[in-house]
C-alpha cells in the first residue's frame, strides 16, 4: 500500500512540476526592467524565452519576437534547449510512468516489468527537473552578468553619440515558477525511484536442484518439515501434522520461483 | 548601432514656427522612446519633449502649448513642431533615442545636433 502511494504521489508531484516547467518555458516574464521613466509615463519591459514586451503606463502593450533580432545572446540558446529537453523527458516519463502505475493493470504485466518502469521514468522525472533547473539559473547568471557588465558608458557613434542606461531589473516569475517546478520534477522523480524499490520483488529466484535416491524412501527432517526426492517437494514447506507418509505423486505441485531443495 | 539625421533647424523670427524632424535607422530591436533635447549656449543640456512608442507625450513646462512632439512608428521619424518662437528657445537642438536591447541595459542614441536660432 505504501509503495503505491509513493508512486501515486510521486506521479502526481512530476506531473505538476512538468506542467510547471512547460508554463514557465512559455511566459514572457522570465526578466522585469525599467527601460524608460518620466513624470508622465513608465514604460515597463518584460522578457520571456521567445519575445519581449513593453508595457506603459498609460495602458499600451506590445510584444515582439526575438526572430527580428540577429545577435540573440547564446545563452538564450542553451536555456531553451534544457528547458524543451525537460519537457521532452518529462512527458515521455508521465507516458512511461502512467503505464508503471501499480493502480492500473494492464495484461499480465508482471511487477518486475513495471518496477522498471518505474525507475526509467524516476531517472526520466530527475533528468527532466535537471534540466529545468540548470536552464533558469543559466537564465539567471546571464542576466546578472549582462546587467553588471553593462555599466554606464557613453561613446561616440555614427551620427552621434551612444549611452547605455543604468535601470532597474528583477528576475520575472517565470524564473521562479521554473525553480519550483524544476524541484517538484525532482522530488517526484525521486519518490518513483523509491517506489521502485517497494516493487521489486524481493526474494532471489534459485533453480530448484534435487537428486533421485535408488528407491522411493521418504525421509523425515527434525520439526516436521517434509523433504522429498523428487521434483514434487512441498514447495510452501508446511508442516505436515497428520504424520502419514505420503508418495511423491501425492504432493506433487509445480515448480515455481519458490523452490527450495 | 542606430543611425540618427536631424534636419530642419535654421534661423526663424520670434513669433515664428518650425519643424524639426529626426530619422532613426540601421539595426535595433526596439525603440522605446524618443524625445527631443535642447543646450543653449553655456547652458546644460534639458529636455524639451518625449514621446513613448505607445504616444505618451511629456513637455517640459517652457515649451507647453507652443510645442508638438510627435512620431512616424512605421517611419522610425520623430517630429518637433515649434509655434510661437521666443529668443529663449535659441539652442541646438538634440534628438534622443531609447532602443531595447535584449537581456541587457538599454541605450540612448543621441544625434549631432541641429541649431535653432530665434532672431530678428
Known amino acids: 500500500m505504501a509503495v503505491t502511494a509513493c508512486q501515486g504521489l510521486g506521479f502526481v508531484v512530476s506531473l505538476i512540476g512538468i506542467a510547471g516547467i512547460i508554463a514557465a518555458t512559455c511566459m514572457d516574464q522570465w526578466s522585469t526592467q525599467d527601460l524608460y521613466n518620466n513624470p508622465v509615463t513608465a514604460v515597463f519591459n518584460y522578457q520571456g524565452l521567445w519575445r519581449s514586451c513593453v508595457r506603459e503606463s498609460s495602458g499600451f502593450t506590445e510584444c515582439r519576437g526575438y526572430f527580428t533580432l540577429l545577435g540573440l545572446p547564446a545563452m538564450l540558446q542553451a536555456v531553451r534547449a534544457l528547458m524543451i529537453v525537460g519537457i521532452v523527458l518529462g512527458a515521455i516519463g508521465l507516458l512511461v510512468s502512467i503505464f508503471a502505475l501499480k493502480c492500473i493493470r494492464i495484461g499480465s504485466m508482471e511487477d518486475s516489468a513495471k518496477a522498471n518502469m518505474t525507475l526509467t521514468s524516476g531517472i526520466m522525472f530527475i533528468v527532466s527537473g535537471l534540466c529545468a533547473i540548470a536552464g533558469v539559473s543559466v537564465f539567471a547568471n546571464m542576466l546578472v552578468t549582462n546587467f553588471w557588465m553593462s555599466t554606464a558608458n557613453m561613446y561616440t557613434g555614427m551620427g552621434g553619440m551612444v549611452q547605455t542606461v543604468q535601470t532597474r531589473y528583477t528576475f520575472g516569475a517565470a524564473l521562479f515558477v521554473g525553480w519550483v517546478a524544476g524541484g517538484l520534477t525532482l522530488i517526484g522523480g525521486v519518490m518513483m525511484c523509491i517506489a521502485c524499490r517497494g516493487l521489486a520483488p524481493e526474494e532471489t529466484n534459485y533453480k530448484a536442484v534435487s537428486y533421485h535416491a535408488s528407491g522411493h524412501s521418504v525421509a523425515y527432517k527434525p520439526g516436521g518439515f517434509k523433504a522429498s526426492t523428487g521434483f514434487g517437494s512441498n514447495t510452501k514447506n508446511k508442516k505436515i501434522y497428520d504424520g502419514g507418509a505420503r508418495t511423491e505423486d501425492e504432493v506433487q505441485s509445480y515448480p515455481s520461483k519458490h523452490d527450495y531443495v | 548601432e542606430v543611425q540618427l539625421v536631424e534636419s530642419g533647424g535654421g534661423l526663424v523670427q520670434p513669433g515664428g514656427s518650425l519643424r524639426l524632424s529626426c530619422a532613426a535607422s540601421?539595426?535595433?530591436?526596439?525603440?522605446?522612446?524618443m524625445g527631443w533635447y535642447r543646450q543653449a549656449p553655456g547652458s546644460q543640456r534639458e529636455l524639451v519633449a518625449t514621446?513613448?512608442?505607445?504616444?505618451?507625450?511629456y513637455y517640459a513646462d517652457s515649451v507647453k502649448g507652443r510645442f508638438t512632439i510627435s512620431r512616424d512608428n512605421a517611419k522610425n521619424t520623430l517630429y518637433l513642431q515649434m509655434n510661437s518662437l521666443r529668443a529663449e528657445d535659441t539652442a541646438v537642438y538634440y534628438c534622443?533615442?531609447?532602443?531595447?536591447?535584449?537581456?541587457?541595459?538599454?541605450?540612448?542614441?543621441w544625434g549631432q545636433g541641429t541649431l535653432v536660432t530665434v532672431s530678428s
Open positions: 534622443n533615442v531609447r532602443v531595447e536591447v535584449p537581456f541587457m541595459q538599454p541605450n540612448d542614441y
Open positions: 540601421g539595426s535595433f530591436f526596439r525603440i522605446v522612446a
Open positions: 514621446i513613448t512608442r505607445g504616444g505618451s507625450t
